[in-house]
Interface confidence: low
Amino acid sequence: ETVHCDLQPVGPERGEVTYTTSQVSKGCVAQAPNAILEVHVLFLEFPTGPSQLELTLQASKQNGTWPREVLLVLSVNSSVFLHLQALGIPLHLAYNSSLVTFQEPPGVNTTELPSFPKTQILEWAAERGPITSAAELNDPQSILLRLGQAQGSLSFCMLEASQDMGRTLEWRPRTPALVRGCHLEGVAGHKEAHILRVLPGHSAGPRTVTVKVELSCAPGDLDAVLILQGPPYVSWLIDANHNMQIWTTGEYSFKIFPEKNIRGFKLPDTPQGLLGEARMLNASIVASFVELPLASIVSLHASSCGGRLQTS
């Protein structure tokens, strides 16, 4: 049976979803156990011109030793105002000084990156040491690069389309995910559904997706269901500021009781099927319907509270 619910974008004041992901348009992670030098290459595209970027490097001890030296090659296509955090990391940064401005003195060794095309930048970086990771990111707002984490199956880093950087790199796109909503025809009441569909990633290892839900309405005003659908290897950690009905695939737990896993359900893996599920749960409004790449953290801010749905 077709569910009549015409999904339309909702205005940002009604709902916004931001997320952090390891999925990249192009990338690679190579093995480097106990590497004496970690080389990481980031190709950053900023389609809307000058941007701000928060870049954090985190070191994890490898068998009790720190990487001796880290080279980060930063290739950008337009001006970027960079907030760099790399405390205690023996970092050497290669970048184009005419495009990258630091929010504060970086306090690391720097060198000018030649104006080469991508392939030559990779070659230039590889001359300095084996490349541990490389990634192409479109319009990042923040990036977390974890050093000493690379566990790729490659011994050599070759950029490939649609890659999962695993724990090595997580990033948050500047543009929030598209949030859509609709009225479920023929259902009375004010129950609202928030549907999050996480698409399969490019590596199928077990993943926990942290879902933060912030609904701006008084607790008593809310009758809502949160529907989380993802690949079988995804479990969910829910951090919500309201009590609501939970309907998920896989297993889920709450941030306040993380050790208590609750078994989920087998849910449809199509938008139509998920809308049908919302209807079956007596939701009259789909306040937010979002499809995302495999993410590690998803934040949903919504203010519909069972009221009138506004689409943009």
Partner: antibody, heavy 118, light 106 residues
């Protein structure tokens, strides 16, 4: 074409000193990580040490067997790599090769023989 | 230090034979490089990053392996292949070479 030419080898008494040179051409020397590798007569290869590029602040690393006695330096303006060997021991007798590290040792000199003997 | 143990230390074979040299690391390494050396000459890069042939190396050579076990294989020995082969790692300080495998004519 990349060329590495070592010089400065010879006979020296135990406890003595010697300075080896390696003249490089055919590539941007200042960007290169340069190493010394040695080979005792009839034996295998042994890494001696490395000096990294200008971009890496000319950082140096040494094998435990030579630490404190050998010093690697470079003169980027002359495209020359050096190995200063002090307090030489008979076990330092070897052919010393100058090499370039670029993912692996992709270029080697012909080597220069150092004999430490009384 | 990571020790690299090559086996066999010497190998006698005939032209046309298949030859396999192994290099075992005392702990896991991310990749292995191989060099060929002929008497009185400097070593030459032969295979890098475990399986990539260096410039000018014939396709009868191949490299494979991961973790602690790596292999150099010559599918059909030619007269010019008789030499000593060394493996080398630098996944961990210090850089180390294997003891070498001498491939001799039977």
């Amino acid at each position: 074409e990349v060329q590495l030419v070592e010089s400065g080898g010879g006979l020296v008494k135990p406890g003595g000193s010697l300075r080896l040179s390696c003249a490089a051409s055919g590539f941007t020397f200042s960007d290169a990580w340069m190493d010394w590798v040695r080979q005792a007569p009839g034996k295998g290869l042994e890494w001696v040490g490395e000096i990294r590029s200008q971009a890496s602040n000319h950082a140096t690393y040494y094998a435990e067997s030579v630490k404190g006695r050998f010093t690697i330096s470079r003169d980027d303006s002359k495209n020359t790599l050096y190995l200063q060997m002090n307090s030489l021991k008979t076990e330092d007798t070897a052919v010393y090769y100058c090499t370039r590290w670029r993912r692996f040792f992709d270029s080697w000199g012909q080597g220069t023989l150092v004999t430490v003997s009384s | 230090d990571i020790q690299l143990t090559q086996s066999p230390s010497s190998l006698s074979a005939s032209v046309g034979d298949r030859a396999t040299i192994t290099c075992r690391a005392s702990s896991s390494v991310s990749y292995m490089h191989w060099y060929q050396q002929k008497p009185g000459k400097a070593p030459k890069p032969w295979i890098y990053a475990s399986s990539n042939l260096a410039s000018g190396v014939p396709s009868r050579f191949s490299g494979s392996g991961s973790g602690t076990d790596y292999t150099l294989t010559i599918s059909s020995l030619q007269p010019e292949d008789f030499a000593t082969y060394y493996c080398q790692q630098w996944s961990s300080n210090p850089l180390t070479f294997g003891g070498g495998t001498k491939v001799e004519i039977k």
